[in-house]
């Protein structure tokens, strides 16, 4: 018996085509992925092959002014539209609290939405039952498939749960849930996820029952042969795990933004068992037509995105300084407008011991494109935040050594005064050059804000202690030349889209003032 | 709206069997599962088994293993539920209920068939 | 199997009091319990599922609360037509087993 898996993950709110490097779509002609696009590749697929299976494996909420505007009533839409069979939550999910994730999403999706390490517990377990479940059994053809689902624990930390809901250990959560199935008599078990590739693999291993893992969180891409576009393959699609039961599992992901449809085809003999596994992501190019009535119910719901890009955020009492000629040189009060709100984007008081799990932001300057004058009434919008970060990139938390910061603060100065990208924008760090020393060697203070402490204050940088810190994807990603930070960070949890992060800051705050106030020093 | 409507009261002989039917409408047929549950009277209620009609797809309680035969007919939407080797304390209601394929509580109920054995 | 023990077997109560009826499973069974009604004659009618999520059209008086073995049904303001049997059913391993049920009956 032949099953089909199609799959997504991590598509983040890109219900429009976008360019190849998942930013706004500028030559329509180049672009890629998009719902209409996914919807004719997926007709076509489920007219052409009988047992077909369409799964997302989570982080479907943020990224775009679509999620901004629409707080994932499009996602409940869309994906009704595309006749999706199952969705595992992912963190991101939880981004607006649980109000955000049941009334919208829970409440509209025509689809099962699965994590079985998620409990909840006090008033919400009521409010909450039945509108996501452990599993789900899906009749496929003549047979049953069972899909059970998971998210990372980490999701109290990357988002914004609330406590009524535990996040459990994967593995343990969902190993009973697996031999309930089984009791079922349900032999064919796909575990749908959101945990990213490393605990895929593992589930891969540990998890008596599982056939195959369906993952995302890491926008792992795998690809069998000459990869089309220009993400490199982390493995093979699939990625083959022997489990510790000496099974063969195959483990897959479809990088994220829409831009692949992950296409694998399982072969199972009469008792479940895995006989052949094979297929590749599919890339969304231009070659793939968008559907027409999936595009036109795009273009009718895109009218509102246009209506609130002009409307006022809050406003400024002094000038926003995002001029290459101050962000690329000096320390400037846009660069800390955008860190202050990357750190209050990310308080989570979940630990009595700690203020908040973190404290630090860096932003490259060169990331910061445009400022904005105070003298059109103060008035900011998300048109003018689009200028200043126009690169549709997130904000994200990572865990870094002492020894790695200390690195990226000697590359932010490293040829200092040539109007470059790298120079760093802070918060919650204070640091001291020497531009009279020579590269390599210019730091000669860098203190951090204290996050174990009830009255935060500044230490001294301990080189071999790890930090969180919250930086953008471009860095994380080792851009700007940042390779240490790419090579040796311990942890990445892809975070907020960037504008969100800001106008969400600029919402709540209502009227803003940042000053230069020192974080950035010369001696 | 979903109807489980179930054939006529039996009376049987000791050693004797019997077919009990269970007609389904008002929902689709071969999505879910149709259990077999059943009460003697003045006692509780006892589950015996149940098939998917997707698949025929049968799963028995033990005690009832060898005893009982459960069949489908999708185009009628029909389960049937044979019990054989009868014996007195066979004597009860028999129930059809439609229960979810993974989650296995019963929401609808067919209105019950007695089925007597007595010599 | 798993034994689903419900206790009391029998109860009387007047109308207006707060009944709590109460299912104990042999071992853990993950929050798969339901409860059903049963009048005389009838049909069992489900009333919750999950433990705590109320069929439509059930009355917001009944709830059911608990989770691993134990397990309970409250009725917070018991009405005449509520005199009846009630049944626990769990329904994490095979087979599916109920309670010996509990009896309500008017003081």
């Known amino acids: 018996w032949e099953l089909t898996i199609l799959h997504t993950n991590d598509v983040h709110s890109r219900l429009e085509q976008t360019s190849e490097d998942s930013s706004k779509c500028v030559n329509a002609s180049r672009c890629m992925g998009g719902v209409a696009r996914l919807f004719t590749k997926v007709q076509q697929i489920r007219r052409a092959e009988p047992n077909v299976l369409l799964l997302d494996a989570g982080d479907q909420y943020q990224g775009t002014i679509w999620f901004t505007v629409y707080k994932g009533a499009e996602v409940a839409h869309f994906m009704n539209a595309l006749r999706y069979d199952a969705m595992a939550l992912g963190n991101h999910e939880f981004d607006n609290g649980v109000e955000g994730l049941i009334e919208p999403l829970l409440k509209e999706a025509k689809f099962p939405i699965l994590s079985a390490n998620i409990k909840a517990k006090g008033p919400l377990a009521s409010q909450i039952s039945g509108l996501y479940l452990p599993y789900k059994v899906l009749p496929v053809g003549d047979e049953v498939v069972g899909i059970v689902g998971y998210t990372s624990k980490e999701t109290p930390f990357l988002s914004n749960p609330g406590t009524n809901l535990v996040f459990e250990d994967e593995i343990t959560a969902l190993q009973p849930e697996v031999d309930k199935l089984k009791t079922l008599n349900v032999n064919k078990i796909i575990a749908l996820g959101h945990s990213g590739f490393e605990m895929d693999k593992l589930i891969a291993q540990k998890v008596r029952g599982v056939d195959v893992v369906v993952g995302g969180h890491s926008n792992t891409f795998l690809y069998t042969g000459n990869p089309p576009s220009k993400e490199v393959p982390a493995g093979k699609y699939p990625f083959i795990v022997t489990s510790d039961d000496g099974r063969k599992v195959p483990v897959v992901q479809a990088y994220a933004f829409g831009k692949y449809l992950g296409y694998l085809k399982i072969e199972f003999d009469e008792r479940g068992n895995v006989i052949s596994s094979h297929g590749n992501p599919i890339l969304l190019n231009s070659s793939i037509p968008e559907d027409p009535s999936i595009k036109a119910d795009i273009n009718k719901w895109r009218i509102k995105l246009d209506n609130y890009s002009t409307q006022e955020l809050g406003k400024t009492i002094v000038y926003l300084d995002g001029s290459s000629q101050s962000c690329r040189f000096r320390e400037c009060n846009m660069g800390n407008l955008i860190c202050d709100a990357m750190i209050n984007n990310n308080l989570r008081h979940t630990d009595e011991m700690f203020w908040n799990h973190v404290s630090m932001c860096i932003l490259n300057g060169g990331g910061i494109r445009s400022p904005i004058d105070e003298r059109n009434n103060g008035t900011i919008t998300w048109e003018n935040l689009a200028a200043v970060l126009p690169f549709g990139g997130t904000f994200d938390l990572v865990q870094l050594k002492g020894s790695t910061l200390k690195k990226a603060f000697e590359h932010s100065v490293h040829r200092y005064g040539q109007s470059t990208g790298e120079f760093l924008q802070v918060g919650g760090i204070h640091v001291v050059y020497d531009l009279s020393r020579k590269p390599g060697d210019r730091v000669v203070k860098l203190d951090v804000l204290c996050t174990k402490c009830r009255v935060p204050s500044y230490d001294p940088l301990k080189m071999d202690e790890v930090y969180k810190v919250i930086l953008p994807n471009f860095l994380a990603n080792g851009g700007d030349g940042f390779q240490m930070i790419k090579d040796e960070l311990l942890r990445h949890d892809s975070g907020d889209q960037d504008i969100n992060v800001v106008s969400t800051y600029i919402s709540k705050m209502k009227v803003i003032y940042p000053a230069v106030e020192g974080r950035i020093k010369f001696s | 709206q979903v109807q489980l409507v179930q054939s006529g009261a039996e009376v049987k002989k000791p050693g004797a069997s019997v077919k009990v039917s269970c007609k389904a409408s008002?929902?689709?047929?071969?999505?879910?599962?149709m259990h077999w549950v059943r009460q003697a009277p003045g006692q509780g209620l006892e589950w015996m088994g149940a098939?998917?009609?997707?698949?025929?797809?049968?799963s028995y309680a033990q005690k009832f293993q060898g005893r009982v035969t459960m069949t489908r007919d999708t185009s009628t939407s029909t389960v049937y539920m044979e019990l054989s080797s009868l014996r007195s304390e066979d004597t009860a209601v028999y129930y059809c209920?439609?229960?979810?394929?993974?989650?296995?509580?019963?929401?609808?109920w067919g209105q019950g068939t007695l089925v007597t054995v007595s010599s | 199997d798993i034994q689903m023990t419900q206790s009391p077997s029998s109860l009387s109560a007047s109308v207006g009091d707060r009944v709590t009826i109460t299912c104990k499973a042999s071992?853990?069974?993950?929050?798969?319990l339901a409860w059903y009604q049963q009048k005389p004659g009838k049909a069992p009618k489900l009333l919750l599922s999950?433990?705590?999520s109320l069929e439509t059209g059930v009355p917001s008086r009944f709830s059911g609360s608990g989770s691993g073995k134990d397990y309970t049904l409250t009725i917070s303001s018991l009405q005449p037509e509520d005199f009846a049997t009630y049944y626990c059913?769990?329904?994490?391993?095979?087979?599916?087993?109920f309670g010996g049920g509990t009896k309500v009956e008017i003081k």
């Open positions: 059913q769990q329904y994490w391993s095979i087979p599916w087993t």
């Open positions: 999950g433990v705590i």
């Open positions: 209920a439609r229960g979810d394929y993974d989650e296995s509580y019963f929401d609808y």
């Open positions: 008002g929902y689709t047929f071969t999505t879910y599962n």
């Open positions: 098939i998917f009609p997707g698949n025929g797809h049968i």
């Open positions: 071992e853990g069974i993950y929050n798969r």
